[in-house]
């Protein structure tokens, strides 16, 4: 028996369902009574789901997994993982045994989009050219860790005095806070981009300083 899985990682959004595809080619006359199917975590060997002795043994992994029972006889051994969490990320191995056995691993990459950045300015009044200001760009509830870029109004990168911190919450999602310290010119636009490297999703925020008032 030969087991096939997708080579590319499966990308799943947090709180959505994901399908880890696995297939085999059944011989003519194959019956489910002959099939032993095991899904497990590749690294820890923890059992995730199994089908043995002709029946679905159910989920051994937080009751959020399911097979496609009607498709098993056609060689579809895919696993459905419901309500994906950050902690589900990793490699899963599909073992199929009929007379002989084979296995293959598939990677699950979890992702969550970042929110539109909010911009704050300190100080936020009585600003004059030559003042040092601190501009903070904050974006929330994303995964994995973001890439953060700052640009001026013409698109030139601002790489100087930037400090970026990323903190995971109890669900493993990141809140990102990036701080730019800059000396004000006569006027100027300061933009931050928060990029999710897995989703290739970009979230933009900007602040324009033209004396008063400020534009966010």
């Amino acid at each position: 028996v030969e087991v096939q899985v997708s080579e590319d990682p499966v990308v799943a959004l947090v709180d959505t369902d994901a399908t880890l595809r696995c297939s085999f080619s059944p011989e003519p006359g194959f019956s489910l009574a002959q099939l032993n199917l095991i899904w497990q975590l590749t690294d820890t060997k923890q059992l995730v789901h199994s089908f043995t002795e002709g029946r679905d043994q159910g989920s051994a992994y937080s009751n959020r997994t399911a097979l496609f029972p009607d498709l098993l006889v056609q060689g579809n051994a895919s696993l459905r993982l419901q309500r994906v969490r950050v902690t589900d990320e990793g490699s899963y191995t599909c073992f199929v045994s009929i007379q002989d056995f084979d296995s293959a691993a598939v990677s699950l990459q979890v992702a969550a989009p970042y929110s539109k950045p909010s911009m704050t300015l300190e100080p936020n009044k009585d600003l004059r050219p030559g003042n040092m200001v601190t501009i903070t760009c904050s974006s929330y509830q994303g995964y994995p860790e973001a890439e953060v870029f700052w640009k001026d109004g013409q698109g030139v990168p601002l790489t100087g005095n930037v400090t970026t911190s990323q903190m995971a919450n109890e669900r493993g999602l990141f809140d990102v806070h990036s701080v730019l310290r800059v000396v004000l010119g006569a006027n100027g636009t300061y933009s931050c981009l928060v990029r999710n490297p897995v989703l290739q999703q970009d979230a933009h925020g900007s602040v324009t300083i033209t004396g008063q008032p400020l534009t966010f």
Partner: antibody, heavy 121, light 108 residues
């Protein structure tokens, strides 16, 4: 019409410096950043850097740090790029181009005609 | 750096023929950040297509672009004599900005 006019061809000796100019016209020069790119003989394009034409803030490709210096003169709507310690490897056509994308998406809608630099002893 | 690999390196086409040039990125890029230029011998590059599929001002409708992820393409639906040129893809999804090595289109 919108255009970027570059200075003429340069033939220089190894070890010296050269300053290439790029004058914008037909638009508000200080509204758009200027990029510089290098095209070697029978070679592709290599991005050198970008300069803010309003305040002179600049950013360089790591490969050209210490080789290229970009400046701008707002009063004459001209961007400059100086290349130092020239070698035969620097012989190429150098282009300036106007940034037309958003802050985070760079592409070039107007290009100078190119300045041919030949470094030879 | 993100490397853009163009293929073919050179190609020849007859007037009226449909041709496709591909640009493969060494890592996934957002389609917003992939652009195409045309450069005729002795001239500066000219913006052809921006953000994968948007035609720049004045570019004939026979040019089109498509793609996502790591695979992008430029298509000329019916080649004309004036299309003989070198075509470059360019990305700014990853820093620094990079160009492909170019595809030279010759007319038969």
């Amino acid at each position: 019409q919108v255009q970027l006019q570059q200075s003429g061809p340069e033939l220089v000796r190894p070890g010296v410096s050269v300053k290439i100019s790029c004058k914008g016209s037909g638009y508000t020069f200080t509204d758009y950043a200027i990029h510089w790119a290098k095209q070697g003989h029978a070679k592709s394009l290599e991005w050198i850097g970008i300069i803010n034409t309003y305040n002179g803030n600049s950013n360089y490709n790591q490969n050209f740090k210490g080789k290229a210096t970009m400046t701008v003169d707002k009063s004459s709507s001209t961007a400059y790029m100086e290349l130092t310690r020239l070698t035969s490897e620097d012989s190429a056509i150098y282009y300036c181009a106007r940034n037309y994308g958003s802050s985070f998406n760079w592409y070039f809608d107007v290009w100078g005609q190119g300045t041919t630099l030949t470094v030879s002893s | 750096d993100i490397v853009l690999t163009q293929s073919p390196t050179t190609m020849a086409a007859s007037p009226g023929e449909k041709i496709t040039i591909t640009c493969s990125a060494s890592s996934s890029i957002s389609s917003n950040y992939l652009h195409w230029y045309q450069q005729k011998p002795g001239f500066s590059p000219k913006l052809l297509i921006y953000s994968t599929s948007n035609l720049a001002s004045g570019v004939p409708a026979r040019f089109s672009g498509s793609g996502s992820g790591t695979s992008y393409s430029l298509t000329i639906s019916s080649v004309e004599a004036e299309d003989a040129a070198t075509y470059y893809c360019q990305q700014y999804s990853g820093y620094p900005l990079t160009f492909g090595a170019g595809t030279k289109l010759e007319l038969k």
